[in-house]
């Protein structure tokens, strides 16, 4: 049986204020059943960055087409980067539960940091 892997290839992503950042995440299996969400930080205080199923995330867009079948690319773009956006971002697979989904596996995380302003 293929074990699900959450792949976040960049450990560090240097970004520029005002620009768009792309955070990559791919998975190796569609299983277990359940959604993938993006968070910044870990633990109970982590911040939800993107949930495709519900919520309003005006600065976030998906890299892959949302009508694509059997999608394994859960990468996102965050526009208009500000200093408040720095931190470590995790894509997290949840296992479908009733009534609550249960966290199943997290990617290793991508640290977003500010790079030097272009001169």
């Amino acid at each position: 049986e293929e074990e699900l892997q959450m792949i976040q290839p960049e450990k560090l992503l240097l970004v520029t204020v005002g620009k768009t950042a792309t955070l990559h995440c791919t998975v190796t299996s569609l299983l277990p059943v359940g959604p993938v969400l993006w968070f910044r930080g870990v633990g109970p205080g982590r911040e939800l960055i993107y949930n495709q199923k519900e919520g309003h995330f005006p600065r976030v867009t998906t890299v892959s087409d949302l009508t694509k079948r059997n999608n394994m690319d859960f990468s996102i773009r965050i526009s208009s980067i500000t200093p408040a956006d720095v931190g470590t971002y995790y894509c997290v697979k949840f296992r479908k539960g009733s009534p609550e989904n249960v966290e199943f596996k997290s990617g290793p995380g991508t640290e977003m940091a500010l790079g030097a302003k272009p001169s």
Epitope: E1, E2, L4, T28, S29, L30, L31, P32, V33, G34, P35, V36, Q52, K53, T62, L66, T67, K68, R69, N70, N71, F74, R95, K96, S98
Partner: antibody
Framework: DVQLVESGGGVVRPGESLRLSCAAS????????MSWVRQAPGEGLEWVST??????YYADSVKGRFTISRDNSKNTLYLQMNSLRAEDTAVYYC???????????????WGLGTLVTVSS | EIVLTQSPATLSVSPGERVTLSCRAS??????IAWYQQKPGQAPRLLIY???SRDTGIPARFSGSGSGTDFTLTISSLQSEDFGVYYC??????????FGGGTKVEIK
């Protein structure tokens, strides 16, 4: 080409058991969820059960009586049906799940079905 | 459990006519609706997913629309091979997956 072939249907008495199988080919079986959907004679479609990896989901009408399982080494889906009732009489379809977007499952390929008749 | 209500139950139409089938959900399901066609003695066949995306190989005369609670499957010009029963299915909130009761499209 994706192919799903059900077997194991037949006529049983109330209270008896039956095991359905679904042989899958033409796709990477182990990475997809699989489901059973049934259709009573002259009636509409009713979802029965879905299996992911080892995560399983059941309709209330079969919970505790039916068990869904899979053998990825054999590309086969199973439905063990115990304590069968007259109202379980139906054609049972095996279906491959497909996702769209970041979650949400529907059924993109179906087998031809196998008929289960529960009658005394 | 989300209930899907399809209307009409039966539709008598002639080949070449435009056909509109309705599916109403008991609560908001966003665009998480699929449509299937089933001919007598055959398995269901996926037509539309995500409310409006045609499955591979489905003719352009089939189209889906709607979001929230009201959905429509349209056949722009009915062909003889389109007769059968059409079902909608929601996958927004499950278990259970639920299907509508079906609309039978028959020859006038």
């Amino acid at each position: 080409d994706v192919q799903l072939v059900e077997s194991g249907g037949g006529v049983v008495r109330p209270g008896e058991s039956l095991r359905l199988s679904c042989a899958a080919s033409g796709f990477s079986f182990s990475i997809y969820a699989m489901s059973w959907v049934r259709q009573a004679p002259g009636e509409g479609l009713e979802w029965v059960s879905t299996i992911g990896a080892d995560d399983t989901y059941y309709a209330d009408s079969v919970k505790g009586r039916f068990t869904i399982s899979r053998d990825n080494s054999k590309n086969t889906l199973y439905l063990q049906m115990n304590s069968l009732r007259a109202e379980d009489t139906a054609v049972y379809y095996c279906a491959k799940d497909s996702t769209v977007g970041w979650s949400g499952d529907f059924f993109d390929y179906w087998g031809l079905g196998t008929l289960v008749t529960v009658s005394s | 459990e989300i209930v899907l209500t399809q209307s009409p139950a039966t539709l008598s139409v002639s080949p070449g006519e435009r056909v509109t089938l309705s599916c109403r959900a008991s609560q908001n399901v966003r665009s998480d609706i699929a449509w299937y066609q089933q001919k007598p003695g055959q398995a269901p066949r996926l037509l539309i997913y995500a409310a409006s995306s045609r499955d591979t190989g489905i003719p352009a005369r089939f189209s889906g629309s709607g979001s929230g609670t009201d959905f429509t499957l349209t056949i722009s010009s009915l062909q003889s091979e389109d007769f059968g029963v059409y079902y909608c299915q929601q996958y927004y909130d499950w278990p259970p997956f639920t299907f509508g009761g079906g609309t039978k499209v028959e020859i006038k």
